[in-house]
Interface confidence: low
């Protein structure tokens, strides 16, 4: 059986991607449950899972609340069975998150290529705008909406026929690109926001060709 | 009672990705289990994967960190791994697994309850 | 990495005798993560015990397990024919989850 020793959180790691903010820690549990509290800097704590067994906790619907601001996280430890119960100094052990500040550090998901048009020697290719969980009067917002013109696509195309790749940039969610008459492209998309020092770059969306379906060609 | 059943194909080539995907019967996937992928390379001992917990979070062998992707499906009640630019050497029968946390007496303990029968991957070209 | 070293590589036993297995942790481990599995050829290993010391659901009495910190011990009281099988330590505490190199029980 347990005992009733109970041990602090250690590991305490944010994992975020377009603002879902998952903050994740060490060990599972033995003898113990833990609740997390998080806060802004100037802010009170705010308690969520509250004695869970769980080694993480889902704090989006906090930090979506203002996504530039910095949060601090905390996991308390409770003795399994005995959560009035705290630790010899009178209070529960508890173990400090690194600060995370929405807008600057959540990783920026996939994108994903919503269409692509060819209208002769010219190809139109638009990204889809992804929907963040961050709200503004009951809407969710995409992430061109939060992030603005802080946010950039790269777009990677190359001839189905070869290897070389070009590079378009935009601070839209649109390609306007040259290419030659009669030749099918492939596609890749890559989010960036440049004046991040972390996570800059999102993984390269799926690779969409031209000849299938997702794409229209019209010739002109 | 809950099962799990491996699939996926028998036979990939090097340096191509190995897919594989767990269905979880006979119970729900976000009952508040791990689900675990574990490999056994032929005639030898047993080397565990990674894991994932209904909500997405993951913990991965750090030995193998680099080229897997443990997912998760709840509507389908399954998850999958994902294991990239594959080897000779990632031949071995997968299985998944359930890792079960169990409250008795005041403590937690955990252990891997439920496995499935187990499907063998050969990488070959 | 917690590395798990089971002794002896390969038990040769009569049917009736008492089989004692051991399995040595690195480091020390918590006996709540601590479990034993029987595998036997072309199936899936099948749990014994848990908690160090916890026998699973329709698992026989014959079948115990002891110890803490570092080393832990499977005991089978009596061989049964059907117990002939590799039997496998595992701790699922600290990641990498790691299995012992398994212990072989053989007909002698």
């Known amino acids: 059986s347990g005992t009733t020793n109970t041990v602090a959180a250690y590991n305490l790691t944010w994992k975020s991607t377009n603002f879902k903010t998952i903050l994740e820690w060490e060990p599972k549990p033995v003898n113990q449950v833990y609740t997390v509290q998080i806060s802004t800097k100037s802010g009170d704590w705010k308690s969520k899972c509250f004695y869970t067994t769980d080694t993480e906790c889902d704090l989006t619907d906090e930090i979506v609340k203002d996504v530039k601001q910095t949060y601090l996280a905390r996991v308390f430890s409770y003795p399994a069975g005995n959560v009035e119960s705290t630790g010899s100094a009178g209070e529960p052990l508890y173990e400090n998150s690194p600060e995370f500040t929405p807008y600057l550090e959540t990783n920026l998901g996939q994108p994903t290529i919503q269409s692509f048009e060819q209208v002769g020697t010219k190809v139109n290719v638009t990204v889809e705008d992804e929907r963040t969980l961050v709200r503004r009067n009951n809407t969710f917002l995409s992430l061109r909406d939060v992030f603005g013109k802080d946010l950039i696509y790269t777009l990677y195309y190359w001839k189905s026929s070869s290897s070389g790749k070009k590079t378009a940039k935009t601070n839209t969610n649109e390609f306007l690109i040259d290419v030659d008459k009669g030749e099918n492209y492939c596609f890749s998309v890559q989010a960036v926001i440049p004046s991040r020092t972390v996570n800059r770059k999102s993984t390269d969306s799926p690779v969409e060709c031209m000849g299938q379906e997702k794409g229209e060609f019209r010739e002109i | 009672q809950v099962q799990l059943q491996e699939s996926g194909p028998g036979l990939v080539k090097p340096s191509q990705t190995l897919s594989l995907t767990c269905t979880v019967s006979g119970g729900s996937i976000s009952s508040g289990q791990y689900w675990s992928w574990i490999r056994q390379h032929p005639g030898k001992g047993l080397e565990w994967i990674g894991e994932?917990?209904?909500?997405?979070?993951?913990r991965y062998n750090p030995s193998l960190k680099s080229r897997v992707t443990i997912s998760v499906d709840t509507s389908k009640d399954q998850f999958s791994l994902k294991l990239s630019s594959v080897t000779a050497a990632d031949t071995a029968v997968y299985y998944c697994?359930?890792?079960?946390?169990?409250?008795?007496?005041?403590?937690?303990?955990?252990?891997?309850?439920?496995w499935g029968k187990g499907t063998t991957v050969t990488v070959s070209s | 990495e917690i590395v798990l070293t089971q002794s002896p590589g390969t038990l040769s036993l009569s049917p009736g005798e008492r089989a004692t297995l051991s399995c040595r942790a690195s480091?020390?481990?918590?006996?709540?993560?601590l479990a034993w599995y029987q595998q036997k050829p072309g199936q899936a290993p099948r749990l014994l015990i848990y908690g160090a010391s916890s026998r699973a659901t329709g698992i026989p009495d014959r079948f115990s397990g002891s110890g803490s910190g570092t080393d832990f011990t499977l005991t089978i009281s009596r061989l049964e024919p059907e117990d002939f099988a590799v039997y496998y330590c595992q701790q699922v505490g600290v990641v990498p989850y790691t299995f012992g190199g398994g212990t072989k029980v053989e007909i002698k």
């Open positions: 994932i917990y209904y909500s997405g979070s993951t």
């Open positions: 697994a359930r890792d079960t946390p169990y409250y008795y007496d005041g403590g937690y303990y955990y252990y891997m309850d439920v």
């Open positions: 480091q020390s481990v918590s006996s709540s993560y």
